[in-house]
């Protein structure tokens, strides 16, 4: 269970109590709420008892016997009231959200496009990256503005697990790596070097580099292939 | 009179008192049985190996698992026979992939590959049964009622399905549904 | 066609510096590593050390720090080698590597031919 | 440095013949190694990499095998240009380091 939420009450708690008013979303929250208010009661308490006991001769001093009193039924008044708050939200709260809950879950069975986590809909999630797998063809340059229009980059690969998945998934693809010409360096897009090597570098008139299962090749620019867009979470 | 009042007041706090501990059990007892409940509720627990994710209506899959459309998805690259997929996947925590539509598995598309999926022939019921014993729905593969009854089920993502031997070693898929 | 020129044979006095080349067609060096390698009959292949073309940063193994320098001409797309302070024990053959390198897969695809260096009074 | 240990420095062996050339690194390689193979008054050509792979072009006689620190390179059904040297070499670390040679002749 995520205890962030406690240790946020216990440690930097705000002058009033405000964060009680945050709507519960789900089980896990609403039982995190509670225990903020306890929490927040228990510091409260605490704040006042001290209080109380700081200024115990000054009251005794100006003989008002019933002050004190006043004080602490005042406190144990206020502390009753967050109690029965606190019980009348963890048995009505729970079951309200066992109903939604159920609710809900029928309703997302029956959506055809549920979609994952930070990924934009119908894109696959994979090693904390999100991709775009598509099947349109396009050239090159056609392909980075689609990605880039998508706010992500035309596919990059960092490893060789990554390049086996992407091979599996796709047999041929684009990737953001191009050269100026046969006498430039192939680089990725943000301008730096790429060292993997290419199949058919040789060829002056291929400047632009596809995924063509498990290895790398060369291809016309112009060519149309497709392409598929990667954004890292 | 002040002693009155003062025995009053100290009466009044003796009861908001109790009335407070009351509640404070009460709460405590609340607590314990939420978070009991909250262990066991099936319908809160997202399942294995897969953690929860925040701001989100769904969840997130193991390492080198593919998320899709609240499903994760294991491709595999090794082949293996169709009863050693099954178990690999069983391992996992998940099964064999079964097929909802055939445009489940639309991002895999264009793949040439077939991959073995839950599907197998119950002589006991003369139907051919996903893992879960529900039976394969007569629209999703046209062809199905040619499959030698003998053979296991592998399935291209574009759509396309195979008999073949349960022997033959092929790739896999498993899955696991995340709501 | 991936190749490797390198020059055939160099004659040098004891205490002289050599500079060996290595020209490559097929490929370019920016995209690659460039290798040395020393073979002497009785010791067999030593690695010398190797050069990113694209940024000039090398790695030496450490009998050869200070005895060898790589550097390249990206314009000629030559690699160079070279040796100074030359003695007896410098004699070999030196050949250059092309470094396949490819997700976590590297290797020697391509060589020169060599290049025998004599060091001799 | 990491030691490669290659053996055997030479075998004679006959057309058709199965051979297997061994190499022990002193520490663990996880795959990092190649084979070369060297004709007699010519240069280097690749033939394996990353433990496993063939070189493009490299007949699939060759074959490579190996874990950890131990590797070998199997040559089926020898022909004869096969007959040459052979070695191995490690790029786990810096300095790659190579073995000794084996030298494969014919009986």
């Known amino acids: 269970m995520d205890n962030q939420g406690v240790i946020y009450s216990d440690l930097n708690l705000p002058p009033n109590p405000k964060r009680q008013q945050r709507k519960p979303k789900g089980n896990k929250n609403s039982i995190l709420a509670t225990e903020q208010e306890i929490t927040y009661a228990e510091l409260n308490l605490q704040k006042a008892s001290q209080d109380f006991q700081g200024n115990d001769k000054t009251y005794h001093c100006k003989d008002l016997p019933s002050a004190p009193e006043k004080l602490i039924v005042g406190i144990l008044g206020i502390i009753c009231l967050i109690l029965m708050a606190s019980v009348v939200t963890i048995v009505v709260i729970p079951s309200t959200l066992i109903q939604r809950h159920n609710n809900s879950s029928l309703n997302t069975r029956t959506q055809k496009a549920r979609h994952c986590g930070h990924c934009p809909e119908e894109w696959i999630t994979y090693s904390n990256s999100c991709y775009y797998i598509g099947k349109e063809r396009r050239t090159w340059e056609e392909s980075l503005l689609a990605c880039t229009s998508k706010n992500s980059s035309l596919l990059s690969i960092d490893n060789e697990e990554e390049m086996k998945f992407l091979s599996i998934i796709s047999p041929s693809s684009w990737i953001g790596v191009f050269r100026n010409s046969s006498h430039h360096p192939w680089v990725t897009m943000n301008g730096l070097a790429f060292k993997h090597e290419i199949k058919d570098s040789d060829n002056a008139e291929l400047n632009c580099a596809v995924l063509q299962v498990n290895r790398l090749k060369s291809a016309q620019c112009g060519s149309s292939i497709i392409y598929h867009c990667k954004h890292k979470l | 009179m002040a002693v009155f009042k003062t025995t009053l007041w100290r009466l009044i706090s003796g009861t908001l008192g109790i009335i407070c501990l009351s509640l404070m059990s009460t709460l405590g007892i609340l607590l314990k049985n939420s978070f009991t409940k909250l262990s066991i509720e099936p319908a809160f627990t997202p399942g294995p190996n897969i953690e929860l994710q925040k701001d989100s209506d769904c969840c997130s899959c193991q390492e080198k698992w593919v998320g899709y459309r609240c499903n994760c998805y294991f491709i595999s690259s090794e082949q293996k026979t169709w009863n050693e997929s099954r178990h690999l996947c069983a391992s996992q925590k998940s099964s064999l992939l079964q097929l909802q539509n055939t445009d489940e598995l639309d991002f895999m598309s264009s793949s040439q590959q077939f991959y073995w999926i839950g599907l197998s022939y119950s002589e006991e019921h003369t139907a051919w049964l996903w893992e879960n014993g529900s039976a394969l729905s007569q629209y999703l593969f046209p062809s199905f009622e040619t499959f030698n009854t003998k053979n296991c089920i592998a399935y291209n993502p574009n759509g396309n399905a195979l008999d073949e031997s349960c022997e033959d070693k092929n790739r896999y898929i498993c899955k696991q549904q995340l709501i | 066609e991936v190749q490797l020129q390198q020059s055939v044979a160099e004659l040098v006095r004891p205490g002289a510096s050599v500079k060996l080349s290595c020209t490559a067609s097929?490929?370019?060096?920016?995209?690659?590593?460039m290798h040395w390698v020393k073979e002497r009959p009785e010791q067999g292949l030593e690695w010398i050390g190797r050069i990113d073309p694209a940024n000039g940063d090398t790695e030496f193994a450490p009998k050869f720090q200070g005895k060898a320098t790589l550097t390249t001409d990206t314009s000629s797309n030559t690699a160079y080698l070279q040796l100074s302070s030359l003695t007896s024990e410098d004699t070999a053959i030196y050949y250059c590597?092309?470094?396949?390198?490819?997700?976590?897969?590297?290797?020697?695809?391509?060589w020169g031919q060599g290049t025998l260096v004599t060091v001799s009074a | 440095d990491i030691l490669m240990t290659q053996s055997p420095p030479s075998m004679s062996v006959s057309l058709g013949d199965t051979v297997s050339i061994t190499c022990h690194a002193s520490q663990g390689i996880s795959s990092n190694i190649g084979w070369l193979q060297q004709k007699p008054g010519k240069s280097f050509k690749g033939l394996i990499y990353?433990?496993?792979n063939l070189e493009d072009g490299v007949p699939s006689r060759f074959s490579g095998s190996g874990s950890g620190a131990d590797y070998s390179l199997t040559i089926s059904s020898l022909e004869s240009e096969d007959f040459a040297d052979y070695y191995c070499v490690q790029y786990a670390q810096f300095p790659w380091t190579f073995g000794g040679g084996t030298k494969l002749e014919i009986k």
């Open positions: 097929g490929f370019n060096i920016q995209n690659t590593y």
């Open positions: 990353h433990g496993t």
């Open positions: 590597g092309r470094e396949r390198y490819f997700y976590g897969s590297r290797g020697f695809a391509y």
